[in-house]
Amino acid sequence: SEVEYRAEVGQNAYLPCFYTPAAPGNLVPVCWGKGACPVFECGNVVLRTDERDVNYWTSRYWLNGDFRKGDVSLTIENVTLADSGIYCCRIQIPGIMNDEKFNLKLVIKPAKVTPAPTRQRDFTAAFPRMLTTRGHGPAETQTLGSLPDINLTQISTLANELRDSRLANDLRDSGATIRIG
């Protein structure tokens, strides 16, 4: 099942997605799409990166993180109820069927009061998932010392435990790495 993220109408939504580039200068293409990840590519692409740049985006969608270091988390600006739904982050690792696919569910709540426009990201506390691609060259993986390597089956459990807890934000800010594979 998808990990759920929440934001209020008028705020910025944040959908986390991470990987560690195997080597400097050789980024892995990533696409973000609206809708669950299909077998190949992303459906309804809203943003795409290539080996070096953000090379396609649509209005209100952008990468605010260190995307060249593997933080390809998506920011959606000034969300409306229509932005609710499943989003796909697809890390397009070379080779047949090597892609890592993450489905993230965005739930938009009506604003409690009419808020002043804010650029604050509304983080929901599900654990941000990180892919470490194992390759040659100086990968810049930062691992939080107190956090063990965990696998895919543990992620959803951990995400559920962390949901609605501030710990997830603290972990993300600490550069915690979940190794997949």
């Epitope: 050789n26 080996e51 070096r52 090379n55 985006w57 993180g65 260190d66 060249r68």
Partner: antibody, heavy 120, light 107 residues
Framework: QVQLVQSGAEVKKPGASVKVSCKAS????????MDWVRQAPGQGLEWLGY????????SYNQKFKGRVTMTTDKSTSTAYMELRSLRSDDTAVYYC?????????????WGQGTTVTVSS | DIVMTQSPDSLPVSLGERATINCKAS??????VAWYQQKPGQPPKLLIY???NRYTGVPDRFSGSGSGTDFTLTISSLQAEDVAVYYC?????????FGQGTKLEIK
């Protein structure tokens, strides 16, 4: 220390081509992108494109697409930028600049510049 | 293309005073902005990368800030050797684009 040494000044006629070289030393040539930037007299900076010597991958400014080609010679750690169908408004100083991964592909080292004058 | 607009075009500042140069992107570029200093007859020199990181060897009177669309280069106490043209550049998406430049001079 890192150095980027460019070829000498060129004077060309409209319609001709120019090929500027940039010899790199002091670092592993294939580990960094090489970008090309130009500056017309008294004007600002304009990005032409880049090449990644490791795999030959390129990206060009659409404005110059079809007129510009970037290549490298790994054996001599040299990058080349060829601009064809020259016009008078191509008169500029052309720089090669190293795109540093650890500085998020901003340009940590620049060549000294090659002046290209296009005049009939 | 993403347009980078610098202000002001020219900035006269007294020695020892603070200088502030602004750069506005036509759309969000995250933190993917660099600042360069260029003196006559020389190539540009990297001062700040990734919006706020001072490059090696750059004096600490230079600082950068901002994210998204609005960026600032600040020189806390102007020195004579800081007289130059300053450029911002976005490297979020190609074609990478530069601001038109700000000429910093002594008042």
């Amino acid at each position: 220390q890192v150095q980027l040494v460019q070829s000498g000044a060129e004077v060309k006629k409209p319609g001709a081509s120019v090929k500027v070289s940039c010899k790199a030393s002091g670092y592993t040539f294939t580990d960094y992108y090489m970008d090309w930037v130009r500056q017309a007299p008294g004007q600002g900076l304009e990005w032409l494109g880049y090449i990644y010597p490791n795999n030959g991958g390129t990206s060009y400014n659409q404005k110059f697409k079809g007129r510009v080609t970037m290549t490298t010679d790994k054996s001599t750690s040299t990058a080349y930028m060829e601009l064809r169908s020259l016009r008078s408004d191509d008169t500029a100083v052309y720089y090669c600049a190293r795109g540093g991964y650890y500085s998020y592909y901003s340009y940590d080292y620049w060549g000294q510049g090659t002046t290209v004058t296009v005049s009939s | 293309d993403i347009v980078m607009t610098q202000s002001p075009d020219s900035l006269p500042v007294s020695l020892g005073e603070r200088a502030t140069i602004n750069c506005k992107a036509s759309q969000s570029v995250g933190n993917n902005v660099a600042w360069y200093q260029q003196k006559p007859g020389q190539p540009p020199k990297l001062l700040i990368y990734y919006a706020s990181n001072r490059y090696t060897g750059v004096p600490d009177r230079f600082s950068g800030s901002g994210s998204g669309t609005d960026f600032t280069l600040t020189i806390s106490s102007l020195q004579a050797e800081d007289v130059a043209v300053y450029y911002c550049q976005q490297h979020y998406s190609s074609p990478y684009t530069f601001g038109q430049g700000t000429k910093l001079e002594i008042k």
